[in-house]
Interface confidence: low
């Protein structure tokens, strides 16, 4: 019986030990599991955060790429804009130069005309005077031949401008190179640049012009597409307002709805009509965001200057024997701080 | 003894069971550990990959941001270039129009001079002829008083400028250089530039002009959008590039370097020309917000000013007997790549 009890006690102990080992193992397993789960949670959290960051970065990248693409388009756009500007302005400039040529040619024509008419007038007057003298002298005395001879030199002296020329001039106006741009008729063109420079001195006792001869200044406040007019170039006060871009005299309509006729003595009215005229700056350097002016590379300079690459043949020189007018296109160093 | 053996067998079994449980637990623990380690490796790998991707994205983003910044600078540069272009061209155009005015004024002066000389010649000749006649007529006949009376009108011919010239001038319309480009007829060109220049001197008793005397200058095809060079104007090569904006002849500076030279007594006219003229800046510096103008290096000034930096001694008249217009400062062909 004692032995039995002893063995049973032994067995009991072993069973308890077994249970203890079992529960210890379970606890160990749970601990390991918990440890791993915590670690896994940290790792998964890291992954989630990383993925979120990746998505954010990818979005940022996509947005920036899209904006970058747009900005590249903008740069191309600017290149196009610059080309347009060059085109507009160079066209204006060539037109101005053409006009200068016209003015020059007309001036020559007029001087020729004046000289010619002067000579003609002298000749015709001398002729009539000679006849007159001949008659007078015949009535006075015998030795006509001598007197006639004395009268002859008249016809040989040129008279410049005399009475006759005065009249003839009034009947034949010098050529006016009135050049009016009418964009309505324009074909194959890009833009209307209406640059108007009016320089009229006050005219007194001016007789009425014949119909259709008014001086027309189209679209006074504008410069057509591409150029508002680098106008106001030292014109007299009377018509400085001609190129104003302000709302001057909007009611002053011209005969053709879009034409403004400046009759005598309206110049002052126009000048006075500019509301804030005294505050206006000189046309030609508008649209300047000066805050954007930074240092500029040579390439940029070239880009900015684009369009200078053109030779404009001006002034077909008709006669090398008169009046040399040197257009000394001297560079001015303008000390304005940008 | 039997009982003992029985108990010992029982104990043995329990021990074996204990060992089995122990090794089973150990195996289980190892398995769990391995499983977690594998899982952890995957997660860590994910994290590493994510981190690598994040770094890549961040790098890409940084690079793109840098490029974007550069591109934005380019855009600003383009804006600045464009503005420079606007200013440069505006200035050139102003100069052209100024020169046109000069040509006009000189033309007037020359016509006046021609007229004056003609009249003076007539007057002096008439005077000498009258004396001559008087002497001759006295030698011929008695009724001198009558003859002298007959000769009187001659002596009234003006010396210098007198009645006759007054009339001739008053009846002679000053040249109108209204340059009108009729773009309706214009073919193969990109834009209409309505540049009208009117420059009329004081005219008294002006008679009506004849109708239909305008001279029409047709717009020729000129540099299109994209601007192939506005030089396609068919002028003669003698005087290419009137208003060149190249940096040639930089030494040809005007008196004050930053002043536009205004020939003969035009200063007063210019000064007077505009109510608030005293507030206006020199031509070619329009629309400048001077408050925003920060200091800029000489290089930048040059870049900004492009070809505007020049004094144009407009029409330095060397000799009133010739009329070749030399437009100096030819344009250099600039191959600018934008």
């Amino acid at each position: 019986e004692l032995k039995k009890n002893e063995f049973q006690g032994e067995l009991e102990k072993q069973r308890e030990q077994l249970d203890k080992i079992q529960s210890s193992h379970n606890f160990q397993l749970e601990s390991v599991n918990k440890l791993y789960q915590d670690e896994k949670a940290v790792l998964v959290n890291n992954i989630t955060t990383g993925e979120r960051l990746i998505r954010v970065l990818q979005d940022q990248l996509k947005t920036l790429q899209r904006n970058y693409g747009r900005l590249q388009q903008d740069v191309l756009q600017f290149q196009k804009n610059q080309t347009n500007l060059e085109r507009k302005f160079s066209y204006d400039l060539s037109q101005c130069i053409n006009q200068m040529k016209e003015v020059k040619e007309q001036c020559e024509e007029r001087i020729e005309e004046v000289t010619k008419k002067g000579n003609e007038a002298v000749a015709s007057r001398d002729l009539s005077e000679n006849n007159d003298q001949r008659q007078q002298l015949q009535a006075l005395s015998e030795p006509q031949p001598r007197l006639q001879a004395a009268g002859l030199p008249h016809t040989e002296v040129p008279q410049g401008k005399g009475n006759v020329l005065g009249n003839s001039k009034s009947q034949t106006p010098a050529p006016s190179s009135e050049v009016v741009l009418d964009s309505k008729r324009q074909v194959e063109k890009e833009e209307t640049n209406e640059i108007q420079v009016v320089n009229e001195e006050p005219q007194r006792d001016r007789l009425p012009q014949e119909p259709g001869r008014e001086q027309v200044v189209e679209d006074r406040p504008v410069g057509g597409r591409g150029f508002g007019g680098a106008g106001e170039l030292g014109q007299t006060p009377q018509v400085q307002a001609a190129l104003s871009v302000s709302q001057e005299n909007p009611e002053m309509e011209g005969p053709e709805r879009d034409q403004l006729v400046i009759p005598d003595g309206q110049e002052e009215e126009q000048e006075a009509a500019g509301e804030g005229r005294n505050q206006q700056k000189l046309r030609g350097e508008d649209d300047y965001n000066m805050d954007e002016n930074e240092a500029e590379s040579e390439t940029d300079k070239q880009a900015a200057l684009a369009g200078n690459d053109r030779n404009i043949d001006v002034f077909n020189v008709e006669d090398q024997k008169r009046d040399t007018i040197n257009l000394l296109d001297q560079r001015e160093k303008r000390n304005h701080t940008l | 003894e039997l009982k003992k053996n029985e108990f010992q067998g029982e104990l043995e079994k329990q021990r074996e069971q204990l060992d089995k449980i122990q090794s089973s637990h150990n195996f289980q623990l190892e398995s769990v550990n391995k499983l977690y380690q594998d899982e952890k490796a995957v997660l860590v790998n994910n994290i590493t990959t994510g981190e690598r991707l994040i770094r890549v994205l961040q790098d890409q983003l940084k690079t793109l941001q840098r490029n974007y910044g550069r591109l934005q600078q380019d855009v600003l540069q383009f804006q600045k270039n464009q503005t420079n272009l606007e200013r440069k061209f505006s200035y050139d155009l102003s100069q052209c129009i100024n020169q046109m005015k000069e040509v006009k004024e000189q033309c007037e002066e020359r016509i006046e001079e021609v007229t004056k000389k003609g009249n003076e010649a007539v007057a002096s000749r008439d005077l000498s002829e009258n004396n001559d006649q008087r002497q001759q007529l006295q030698a011929l006949s008695e009724p001198q008083p009558r003859l002298q009376a007959a000769g009187l009108p001659h002596t009234e011919v003006p010396q210098g400028k007198g009645n006759v010239l007054g009339n001739s001038k008053s009846q002679t319309p000053a040249p109108s250089s209204e340059v009108v480009l009729d773009s309706k007829r214009q073919v193969e060109k990109e834009e209409t530039n309505e540049i009208q220049v009117v420059n009329e001197e004081p005219q008294r008793d002006r008679l009506p002009q004849e109708p239909g005397r305008e001279q029409v200058v047709e717009d020729r095809p000129v540099g299109g959008r994209g601007f192939g060079g506005a030089g396609e104007l068919g002028q003669t090569p003698q005087v290419q590039a009137a208003l060149s904006v190249s940096q040639e002849n930089p030494e040809m500076e005007g008196p004050e370097r930053d002043q536009l030279v205004i020939p003969d007594g035009q200063e007063e006219e210019q000064e007077a020309a505009g109510e608030g003229r005293n507030q206006q800046k020199l031509r070619g510096e329009d629309d400048y917000n001077m408050d925003e103008n920060e200091a800029e290096s000489e290089t930048d000034k040059q870049a900004a000013l492009a070809g505007n930096d020049r004094n144009i001694d407009v029409f330095n008249v060397e000799d009133q007997k010739r009329d070749t217009i030399n437009l100096l400062d030819q344009r250099e062909k600039r191959n600018h790549t934008l």
Partner: antibody
């Protein structure tokens, strides 16, 4: 957000005058060329006027030249259209538009206001 | 001036199908710089016009890629590949090679 709000429309008799305004917000007004475009009752679109960012370069079609004057006040972020000698054919919805990119006047209208209606009738 | 010509109405279209709208200019809009200065605007009912296409073939920002445009210097076509209800309105072509001009507009309606 770019916003253009026109005002000043109304009923005017032929020969009368009117001034339209356009208040701009959401962008740097002074950096952009601005235009007016109108839409006739027949739904035809017609460009009316354009002004460069600083106000120097101004363009009009022949139909309004000499009668309409475009101007701007960059300090007030406002665009104006002064109309005079109005005709019945000027009856339209007038839209204030921003031109894509500053400086050039060849580019498309990227933003439009809601429009203001002008009726010219006796 | 350059005249832009459009048909007043497009053939009524079924949702999901494609439609083409034509436009013709009186002068070539292709410039020597390679850019064709043609634009398409859409005016939805009760709204202001909005830009769809610039320089003939470029899609404006925010415009779905169902829209495409092609053409020569004078003949242009706007194509909508899968018409949606929101596409109804008046489609205007415009040029700015010269002073701006618009076509008369083509009205698109759904069957």
């Amino acid at each position: 957000d770019v916003k253009l709000v026109e005002s000043g429309g109304g009923l005017v008799k032929p020969g009368g005058s009117l001034k339209l305004s356009c208040a701009a917000s959401g962008f740097t007004f002074s950096s952009y060329t601005m235009s007016w475009v109108r839409q006739t009752p027949e739904k035809r679109l017609e460009w009316v006027a354009t002004i460069s960012r600083g106000g120097t370069y101004i363009y009009y079609p022949d139909s309004v030249k000499g009668r309409f004057t475009i101007s701007r006040d960059n300090a007030k972020n406002t665009l104006y259209l002064q109309m005079s000698s109005l005709k019945s054919e000027d009856t339209a919805i007038y839209y204030c538009t921003r031109e894509y990119f500053s400086g050039d006047t060849y580019d498309y209208f990227d933003y439009w206001g809601q429009g203001t209606t002008l009726t010219v009738s006796s | 001036e350059i005249v832009m010509t459009q048909a007043a109405f497009a053939n009524p279209v079924t949702l999901g199908t494609s439609v083409s709208i034509s436009c013709r200019s009186s002068k070539s809009l292709l410039h020597s710089n390679g850019i064709t200065y043609l634009y398409w605007y859409l005016q939805k009912p009760g709204q202001s016009p909005q830009l769809l296409i610039y320089q003939m073939s470029n899609l404006a920002s925010g415009v779905p890629d169902r829209f495409s445009s092609s053409g020569s210097g004078t003949d242009f076509t706007l194509r909508i590949s899968r018409v949606e209800a929101e596409d109804v309105g008046i489609y205007y072509c415009a040029q700015n090679l010269e002073l701006y001009t618009f076509g008369g507009g083509t009205k698109l309606e759904i069957k």
